[in-house]
Interface confidence: low
């Protein structure tokens, strides 16, 4: 199936040009998306091209600037947030990145009613997190690991917590491991729907071992970065959840929410918090051995000013074949009765589907079913449930948006997106206004991305928000590669693959093959999305065939494939890449003397193991920031899939699955190993240990480090990295420079 055909005709060939590496590094062919910042059922804010903050009313068709670019520029603001009562806007400047989601910033409050910045009781700096209450203009913020509350922006702050301490106690923000592997947010506080209560997490990292690495900077002596970072089997953070009444914060102070007894009996995690009403909250907990999750619904007791979590409102989710959930345990979407909810979890056939839980999980009503998976519940209204799935035409790498009418019986299902722009758009996400009165659809491909606005009642398209016309015009004279998404059936396993082919591809010729791999549990690489990236250039200009393969352990094709890697990472992911390569060779257009593999992070681990598999298939390969031993990686992630590195659990496979154990096998391949020295995520330690093992085995290899760079290798390092990898591959494939 050719998803993105090259628009090359013989008459046009002389005016068409191939992609260049410069195009990729300059972001010449990057696309834009439009996500409305909804502020009501029919209104949204958007930052215009000239940086004005504009309010759009869909129903009146009116738009006006609520905040000028002049005001934004006056404090060098890069972000903003309107208070729900629309009286104030916070302006965010001095952005300073910390980890994946976290950053600190300076905040200014602008009063829209008088057109001036709020003076007096200004916010301290730098702030770790700040947010408005859902109603009115209360402010909660985190400063130096403590939480503060302001009833109004100009008021003095009320200090909620006092025990916050750098790298020790975190209030309202996650520590490193919770940020990266559990919450996937920079915050750990949650307002109740009307702003009466504020819930927050406290993380105690006092006993966690610290990872320390040098940050070289420009000074005479390097700095040492210290991060409490629990590696597999190490001591974990201790988490507690508190709730405070924000109307009378000093009355009884923060009240702790009790942990379910079956969870509290051993090491555990808090996984998410969902407010149901102002006086009902839902917490999700997870055992350290991550196959048991408990959802606990708690109610406020006015008489005692405490939170009560009856056992009758505890719902257990357990996996007998793997870990609980997909990448994370799914979160509930509550219905209007404020007790029943919709949630995605595995059905009896091992496919993730939407279930409706009214009293117990055992009595759950299955809402969707089939040999495909429901992926996300976007919104539940009185009469509709909107979700995404990969059901349509049985392509796991697509995403379409569906509406189920839950107001009628039996519920009817409608695909909202399947036939809108069928060739151009097969991978959607959505963003809904209050009560799903309107929604935006963002299509990511396989054609050029497009964002559109729709009526939530009729699904009618109202207008195009962004169609990337400039990009479309810029691509008119570019010889883009062809892309195919197909599947291989091997030993009762379906291996979906994406192949990126040179523009003048001829099946009778032989081409060098590059495998790009990620392959981590619950990931998906074969997706019907648009991209003009490094591998597009390698196909377009350098004439390579590039393939991406989703093997065992990858997501959205059922639990059999997903949980196949449980407790044995590094085995089947590698086998399936190798199997696919053999199948590609059989297709007849691959030069089997010129096959390479590359990957980043988990992909660097898989590419390293594939190179060291002893098959003789690969001439060369690249590992960027690879994991080399699961004992070096974060507890929350690693133990989810591998269990504990103890003798009575899974230590043997921890030891057997290292890259270092296969050092000898690198002798007959060209290996390029790359890592940033300030990688907070996959520590440089991983590559240092690979390099040491290769040296000890007297195996030659190539390496590149990026000083003071993290896991993303951003900025000028990106250009250096891709230029360096390009030279390496061209040399490997004997392609002239």
């Amino acid at each position: 199936i050719v998803l993105r055909p090259s628009r090359v005709h013989n008459s046009e060939e002389n005016t068409m040009r191939a992609l260049t590496l410069k195009d990729i590094l300059n972001g010449t062919f990057s696309y834009k998306t439009f996500f409305p910042n909804w502020i009501s059922g029919q209104e949204y804010l958007h930052q215009s091209a000239d940086n004005n903050i504009v309010l759009y009313n869909i129903e009146t068709g009116q738009s006006y600037t609520i905040l000028s670019n002049r005001t934004m520029k006056s404090v060098n603001a890069s972000n903003y947030g309107l208070s729900p009562d629309r009286q104030f806007v916070y302006l965010e400047s001095d952005y300073s990145k910390l980890w994946r989601y976290s950053y600190t910033a300076t905040y200014y409050i602008y009063d829209l009613s008088n057109g001036e910045f709020v003076r007096g009781n200004e916010l301290p700096r730098p702030i770790q997190y700040l947010c408005w209450s859902p109603v009115g203009s209360k402010l909660a913020y985190v400063y130096q690991n403590n939480i503060y509350l302001k009833q109004r922006p100009g008021d003095p702050p009320f200090q909620i917590t006092f025990n916050g301490r750098e790298n020790k106690i975190f209030n309202g923000i996650p520590d490193w491991v919770y940020e990266e592997e559990m919450l996937a947010t920079k915050y750990a506080l949650w307002w109740s729907p009307n702003g009466k209560f504020l819930a927050y997490a406290e993380f105690n990292d006092t006993d966690i071992p610290v990872i320390a690495y040098s940050y070289y900077g420009d000074e005479q002596y390097p700095r040492t970065i210290n991060i409490p970072y629990p590696k597999a089997g190490a001591k974990n953070p201790v988490v507690r959840i508190f709730i405070i009444d924000t109307t009378y914060p000093a009355y009884v102070g923060p009240q702790e929410v009790p942990v379910p007894a079956m969870i509290a009996s051993s090491d555990y995690y808090f996984s998410w918090l969902t407010w149901v009403t102002d006086e009902r909250v839902c917490l999700q907990w997870l055992k350290r051995v991550q196959n048991v999750s408990v959802l606990s619904i708690c109610d406020f007791r006015e008489d005692w000013q405490t939170w009560d979590c009856p056992k009758t409102q505890e719902h257990i989710e357990e996996s007998r074949t793997g870990w609980a959930g997909g990448f994370f345990v799914s979160t509930p979407v509550f219905s209007y009765d404020a007790i029943s909810y919709y949630k995605i979890f595995s059905d009896k056939d091992g496919y993730k589907h939407i279930h409706y839980i009214k009293d117990t999980v055992e009595n759950a009503i299955q809402i969707t079913s089939g040999k495909w998976e429901a992926i996300n519940i976007f919104r539940v209204t009185q009469d509709s449930l909107f979700y995404s799935s990969n059901e349509f035409e049985e392509y796991p790498g697509r995403r379409n948006i569906y509406r189920i009418s839950i107001g009628s019986y039996p519920p009817s299902k409608k695909c909202v997106t399947c036939h809108l722009r069928k060739e151009r758009c097969q991978y959607y996400t959505a963003s809904f206004s209050d009560y799903a009165k309107y929604y935006a659809l963002v299509c990511y491909g396989p054609g050029i991305p497009i964002s559109t606005l729709h009526d939530g009642r009729t699904d009618q398209e109202i207008k195009i928000l962004e169609e990337n016309k400039e990009l479309e015009n810029a691509l008119k004279n570019i010889q883009l590669p062809k892309e195919e998404i197909k599947k291989l059936e091997v030993d009762e396993i379906t291996l979906w693959y994406k192949m990126i082919l040179p523009p003048q591809f001829d099946r009778s010729k032989k081409y060098p093959l590059l495998i790009q791999v990620y392959g981590g549990p619950c990931s998906q690489s074969v997706r019907s999305v648009f991209a003009v990236n490094w591998i597009s250039y390698l196909a377009s200009k350098e004439g390579m065939v590039i393939a991406l393969v989703d093997g065992r352990g990858t997501a959205f094709q059922g639990d059999k494939l997903l949980y196949a890697v449980y407790r044995k990472l590094g085995v089947y992911e590698v086998e399936d890449q190798i199997t696919a390569v053999r199948k590609f060779i059989e297709m007849g257009f691959i030069d089997e003397k010129r096959i390479a593999i590359w990957g980043w992070s988990y992909g660097g681990y898989v590419s390293s193991l594939a190179l060291a598999s002893g098959t003789g298939l690969f001439k060369c390969g690249i590992a960027v920031a690879p994991v080399s031993s699961w004992e070096y990686y974060a507890s929350v992630y690693t133990e989810r899939f591998m269990g504990l590195p103890t003798k009575d659990d899974n230590l043997e496979h921890y030891k057997n699955s290292t890259v270092m154990a296969r050092a000898e096998y690198f002798r007959n391949v060209d290996y390029l190993l790359i890592h940033g020295t300030a990688d907070d995520n996959v520590h440089f330690q991983n590559s240092a240990q690979i390099a040491k093992a290769l040296v000890n085995a007297q195996v030659d290899f190539q390496a590149m480090w990026y000083s003071d760079q993290n896991h993303g290798l951003s900025g000028l390092s990106t250009n250096h990295l891709y230029t360096h990898m390009t030279h390496f591959l061209k040399q490997c494939f004997s392609l002239s420079d």
Epitope: S40, G41, T60, Y64, T65, L82, R86
Partner: nanobody
Framework: QVQLQESGGGLVQAGGSLRLSCAAS????????MAWYRQAAGKQRELVAG???????NYAHSVKGRFTISRDNAKNTVYLQMNSLKPEDTAVYYC??????????WGQGTQVTVSS
């Protein structure tokens, strides 16, 4: 562009009551939030009370419990019932949508004077 006409102001003794009205030239049902503002001599304009389409209200600390905002979508009118008036409530009262539009969208306002 919506035209707004405020009325109902006047001179009143401290402790007295007034009901202000704001008539809009366009339907207000699709305007998410309407609000009353006031500006005392030599002071900045401030929000007094706001009301959203779903009926949720918001009041300045100084008027909470004394003033009540309401809206009649059928009549395209927003009201402000002011009880237990104090001298410090003396100001010109304006209505507008929330957040306020550009300066030219403001009405003439209605003067409220509370004598002690």
């Amino acid at each position: 562009q919506v035209q707004l006409q405020e009325s109902g102001g006047g001179l009143v003794q401290a402790g007295g009551s007034l009901r202000l009205s704001c008539a809009a030239s366009l339907k207000i049902s699709s305007i998410n939030a309407m609000a009353w503002y006031r500006q005392a001599a030599g002071k900045q304009r401030e929000l007094v009370a706001g009301i959203a389409t779903d009926g949720r209200t918001n009041y300045a600390h100084s008027v909470k419990g004394r003033f009540t905002i309401s809206r009649d979508n059928a009549k395209n009118t927003v009201y402000l019932q002011m009880n237990s008036l104090k001298p410090e409530d003396t100001a010109v009262y304006y209505c507008n949508q929330w957040p306020p539009r550009a300066l030219d969208a403001w009405g003439q306002g209605t003067q409220v004077t509370v004598s002690s």
